[in-house]
Amino acid sequence: GALEVQVPEDPVVALVGTDATLCCSFSPEPGFSLAQLNLIWQLTDTKQLVHSFAEGQDQGSAYANRTALFPDLLAQGNASLRLQRVRVADEGSFTCFVSIRDFGSAAVSLQVAAPYSKPSMTLEPNKDLRPGDTVTITCSSYQGYPEAEVFWQDGQGVPLTGNVTTSQMANEQGLFDVHSILRVVLGANGTYSCLVRNPVLQQDAHSSVTITPQRSPTGAVEVQVPEDPVVALVGTDATLRCSFSPEPGFSLAQLNLIWQLTDTKQLVHSFTEGRDQGSAYANRTALFPDLLAQGNASLRLQRVRVADEGSFTCFVSIRDFGSAAVSLQVAAPYSKPSMTLEPNKDLRPGDTVTITCSSYRGYPEAEVFWQDGQGVPLTGNVTTSQMANEQGLFDVHSVLRVVLGANGTYSCLVRNPVLQQDAHGSVTITGQPMTFPPEA
């Protein structure tokens, strides 16, 4: 039969510039001598010869004189190859081919890696920064391999995904320099972190920059928003109220107004230097231009969706700046529940029935209550499931298993906790007349 050749299943990971051992072994029979051995290492794809041993002699490296065998270990079946000063170009599959009487071969993968340098951060512009200014933060990390994954986040660790451009360029050695550019509208102040990850080494290199915009000696702008969340029905329009107190002589040319998502800092809508810069949020937002000069910075959000739910920051900068966050709570009423009964015929006292109460397209998740005809809660043996559709609206299905009495009414109440809206349905079951003894 064929000779069994063993190599590691997982790729061998080697750092650029270091030496790597590509393990390969076979089981020599008793009385085996090296004179019988033919060993060939070659590149799996191109069949290019890398190193060989034949007729009892090491035939040497055919691969830039950077390979070696372990001659003292060959007789014990160790056919491993030492690859020196690993380069990016070495990455790939190497086949270890062993022939004695029979022959066998196996391929081992070499995965080359190089750690990325600690990122350097540049900020443009880097002086006279004000809230509302757009800045470009560049994160550069050098001489890594393979291509990096780059992540941006704010000081709270929230990912920043919008307006990121990342480019990676390989040098002559095949190592990558990565440059990632984040464009961001400045808030009151902020920390921006860049993390460069080597996916093979699972090595993270990170740096951050903290930007504190210029403050005016005349003091901050006071921004007012409602304390309670704004509740908006799905599909309707919502107004996120925000106001400031303009000073005498205030003109809109002096105003920087930015609405952004509080967590991700994603721009929603802006007004700068006398002009409405428009919606950056699916064209569903609008300001109240005729009211801005009076200090009304409110935002109109049209055709509200479940995905809009969350906190929005209203950021006002005139001489100085101020900001406040308003929460949007999205809601959708639940439909009147439909009730199904199984089984639904030939029912007798003592039978177990399943009553299903279904209500559709509500938000947020519902609270479901069951009760009997006297209003007594039924808590035992209730299973409720809620599934969100593509729009994020919930369909609720609640199942009650109950043993029938002589007759009974069973009510299901579906409550929307935000709207405090109750939708209910009920079913009345009248069992067949009982005969004694009950029929078998």
Partner: antibody
Amino acid sequence: EVQLVQSGAEVKKPGSSVKVSCKASGYTFTAYWMNWVRQAPGQGLEWIGRIEPYDSETRYNQNFRDRVTLTVDKSSSTAYMELSSLRSEDTAVYYCARGVRIFDYWGQGTTVTVSS
Amino acid sequence: DIQMTQSPSSLSASVGDRVTITCRTSENIDYTLAWYQQKPGKSPKLLIYNANTLEEGVPSRFRGSGSGTHFTLTISSLQPEDFATYFCKQAYDVPRTFGGGTKVEIK
């Protein structure tokens, strides 16, 4: 090193147009607004307008709005200022300058002479 | 537009003199004022921004002050290389507007 290099001097006839270029290097071109400022002989400085290279948003001085067009070519990091319907009082040195509130780097200036 | 009034329009001084240039604005611009120096045949050079922040590389003999509508540029001890024209510029509103300039000449 940040540099703004402008195109050479121009002599134009009244009623014609002139297009001045400003090639930027040494910084991220899309990170800074590019302003255009002119200076008539022996006079002060007059702001014409500015453009944001990232998305080509422009702001103009109303005095020039009908006659000036600001554009950029991001691939070559070059900003352009075109002034039409030239008259003799447009004779001036035209500068590009980067920044939004502070103009920290200026081009060397392009002399535009309008003469019949 | 915000009007910028610079005074004097010119002055003569000697090396070592203390020189003060004034800039007034037609409305409150808070502290958003910059000062530029221009030598004959050259581009303007930024000296001071935000009324009192010295640009990198500018000698400390230049000092800006003021806020609101009244601003001054002071050169504590005039040097030969300081003979030039100085402009103020407001960055509070669009259009940006410049003062008429002050020419500092050798006495």
